[in-house]
Interface confidence: low
Amino acid sequence: SIPWNLERITPPRYRADEYQPPDGGSLVEVYLLDTSIQSDHREIEGRVMVTDFENVPEEDGTRFHRQASKCDSHGTHLAGVVSGRDAGVAKGASMRSLRVLNCQGKGTVSGTLIGLEFIRKSQLVQPVGPLVVLLPLAGGYSRVLNAACQRLARAGVVLVTAAGNFRDDACLYSPASAPEVITVGATNAQDQPVTLGTLGTNFGRCVDLFAPGEDIIGASSDCSTCFVSQSGTSQAAAHVAGIAAMMLSAEPELTLAELRQRLIHFSAKDVINEAWFPEDQRVLTPNLVAALPPSTHGAGWQLFCRTVWSAHSGPTRMATAVARCAPDEELLSCSSFSRSGKRRGERMEAQGGKLVCRAHNAFGGEGVYAIARCCLLPQANCSVHTAPPAEASMGTRVHCHQQGHVLTGCSSHWEVEDLGTHKPPVLRPRGQPNQCVGHREASIHASCCHAPGLECKVKEHGIPAPQEQVTVACEEGWTLTGCSALPGTSHVLGAYAVDNTCVVRSRDVSTTGSTSEGAVTAVAICCRSRHLAQASQELQGSTSGSGLNDIFEAQKIEWHEHHHHHH
Amino acid sequence: QEDEDGDYEELVLALRSEEDGLAEAPEHGTTATFHRCAKDPWRLPGTYVVVLKEETHLSQSERTARRLQAQAARRGYLTKILHVFHGLLPGFLVKMSGDLLELALKLPHVDYIEEDSSVFAQ
């Protein structure tokens, strides 16, 4: 009886009709940059204020007839999806609409820029509560549009945009490619990526998450009580704008970085059939479908992390790729990946006062990706400790020697074109968890962080026989901060984090005999923050009987490490 | 925005001295870049967003826009300033011939110029 899309974004064990109160999102204002809208539609009447902003190009074609219902169609539907009485996500959110798309759904980059500037000026003149800006539009990659989005985001505005309906890499489009914007792809009732005619939803590393975007029932501009089904990444973005409004209404102080991390954290994981995406995009595309959090509060104690992939380095010998975290995030680890396996590892380095993750291509390689693990860790003080290649045959090792610093990630980088296999694999001595080890010809980089209550442990999973993929996951209550492979030999394609699982990929089994050089160990560093837990508990009071602290005390950490001896 | 097409004579006279001086010459070695949409059918040649360096004030943006108009007028080109940006990015939106791009890229404070392009409802 309730539309599938509203059911889908409701957390398990909750009923959508009871979960979405009539004032959900009421502290938030959502700006919609789209077509004109039918503001007296029953779904949105009294909820949407039509601003006097209009900047649209002339319609194409001499025989074009301006028909009000057609002109208003796209915007009216989206306003309904965000805040409609019946079919809306955030039924209490108030909206303001700006007309930047004409009756054919076409606008300009310049018109959109002027619209964004209008929002910024409105915000300065009359500061209100949290602002969400919905951009259900896309054009080709635009440096200036991305820059404007970045500035608005840095002014505290949450921007949500459509990934695009071109069945293509979202990084080729704007504003979808702007890192500060929350970019949303579309999935259907079967959690499949949405196909739209011969095209479909965009994908790739510039997409933050997916949301319902096919057969979405919402307000139709044909009459004031009409409803219609529409599909597209605009509809998906409207769902996320609504979810963002709900979250911000519950926690108005959330920063953009915190909101993005929560959107990712509360999403349904690994439900999308990746076979729909081109093979080279599967690893880059997040397998996440947006959902509302199970309760409005209580997420604050968790250590939130996300994985950020760089652009592809390109194939030149000295090519590098750089992955960056958002300004409010900490880079806790850095890894790399190459489909050909030809890479020279990765390193964390300072750039403009912030750590970035840089991956290095190798001669004959088709290029590499850098993969950053970006986390929310307030009051963190992180540094990188480096050990040059070791002289001895034991391999290189580096540890966190400063008092109170814990190891959050390990990276290794080598200058030689091909690392020889390294037998036997280096075993970490018991009782020394705070150290990274690697190949003797590689320099090793340890990410060492001090933050109140931060504790980490190392978890390994080794496979003696060659296997294309080795994984190790952090258990409930712990967050994956670091993911790397032991040893860093040439048949390892790389390592990367998927949600809370560390994935190490190796060359096709058939190319690496079954000798010990096929052996691979995936190394995960799992962390949690007792400080965040305590702060959250203080905020909520001790209403829950036994507090989180007691739970943590009962689970005193033991530094268990399972060492796999390969024969 | 009022039509400024009739103001060239006055602008040329007013800006001649400023233009000939080196007070606001672009810094040595920093060249502004030009960008346009990779998807040809979506390009909108003839309209350009001139983005100025980050700390540029509104008055400098307006002065740079007038300077472009004056220099264009001296070369016999009509231009129209459609919008002056401030608040998010400093710069201006100008309707002009693509022939003037080389000239515009050499203006003081210019960071980059982007040709306007289409966006579409998704």
Partner: antibody, heavy 121, light 112 residues
């Protein structure tokens, strides 16, 4: 004038279904949600759910979710409530009531006269 | 679900008396966007359908005599009849519409 006229009394056996109608007149049917409320003998009022005639969307109280179906026929401005797998404790007066479809008007300003449904073997 | 608790469940009074019925909700009914309390009061006479008296906690429905008034905000609400008339003897229900709809159990007002 505005009125909601409900169908007549019904006597049903346990396990059967009942379908009650509510015909609206004197106003634009699509502009108001139609709610159904029941009242067992000597008891209070119990909200069952609603239908939005313009969209056909329904929301049901969880106590009835598996057994109730609300529908409408906009061509004759009539709403229907069907309750299946009847039990003796479903014996009650069933009311339809309208609510203006506007987010500040969450109250029922016009009610039907009620339909008595008796479930007895 | 939001629970609605009315008190008293019954009361006896005489014509001309001032009568107060209270209603408590298990969570706030104040809609933060509209600044309105989503609470209504209904009157029901035997064998009849309920009739709307008050909505938004304190707004009288048109045609309802001004001796009926509603007050309160958040979780505590009151229906007051300033001077009882013979036709006022009935059962009164409060109802929340903040999240779906729930009625109070009713207050039966009888002649003393």
């Amino acid at each position: 004038q505005v009125q909601l006229v409900q169908s007549g009394a019904e006597v049903k056996k346990p396990g059967a279904s009942v379908k009650v109608s509510c015909k609206a007149s004197g106003y634009t049917f699509n502009d108001y949600w139609m709610h159904w409320v029941r009242q067992a003998p000597g008891q209070g009022l119990e909200w069952m759910g609603y239908i939005n005639p313009s969209s056909g969307f329904t929301k049901y109280h969880q106590n009835f979710k598996d057994r109730v179906t609300m529908t409408r026929d906009t061509s004759i401005s009539t709403a229907y409530m069907e309750l299946s797998r009847l039990r003796s404790d479903d014996t009650a007066v069933y009311y339809c009531a309208r609510q203006y479809d506007y987010d500040e008007d969450w109250y029922f300003d016009v009610w039907g006269q009620g339909t008595t449904v008796t479930v007895s073997s | 679900d939001i629970q609605m608790t009315q008190s008293p469940s019954s009361l006896s009074a005489s014509v001309g008396d001032r009568v107060t019925i209270t209603c408590k909700s298990s969570q706030s009914l104040l809609n933060s966007r509209t600044r309105k309390n989503f609470l209504a009061w209904y009157q029901q006479k035997p064998g009849k359908a309920p009739k709307l008296l008050i909505y938004w906690a304190s707004t009288r429905e048109s045609g309802v005599p001004d001796r009926f008034s509603g007050s309160g905000s958040g979780t505590d609400f009151t229906l007051t009849i300033s001077s009882l008339q013979p036709e006022d003897f009935a059962t009164y229900y409060c109802k929340q519409s903040f999240n779906l709809f729930t009625f109070g159990q009713g207050t039966k007002l009888e002649i003393k």
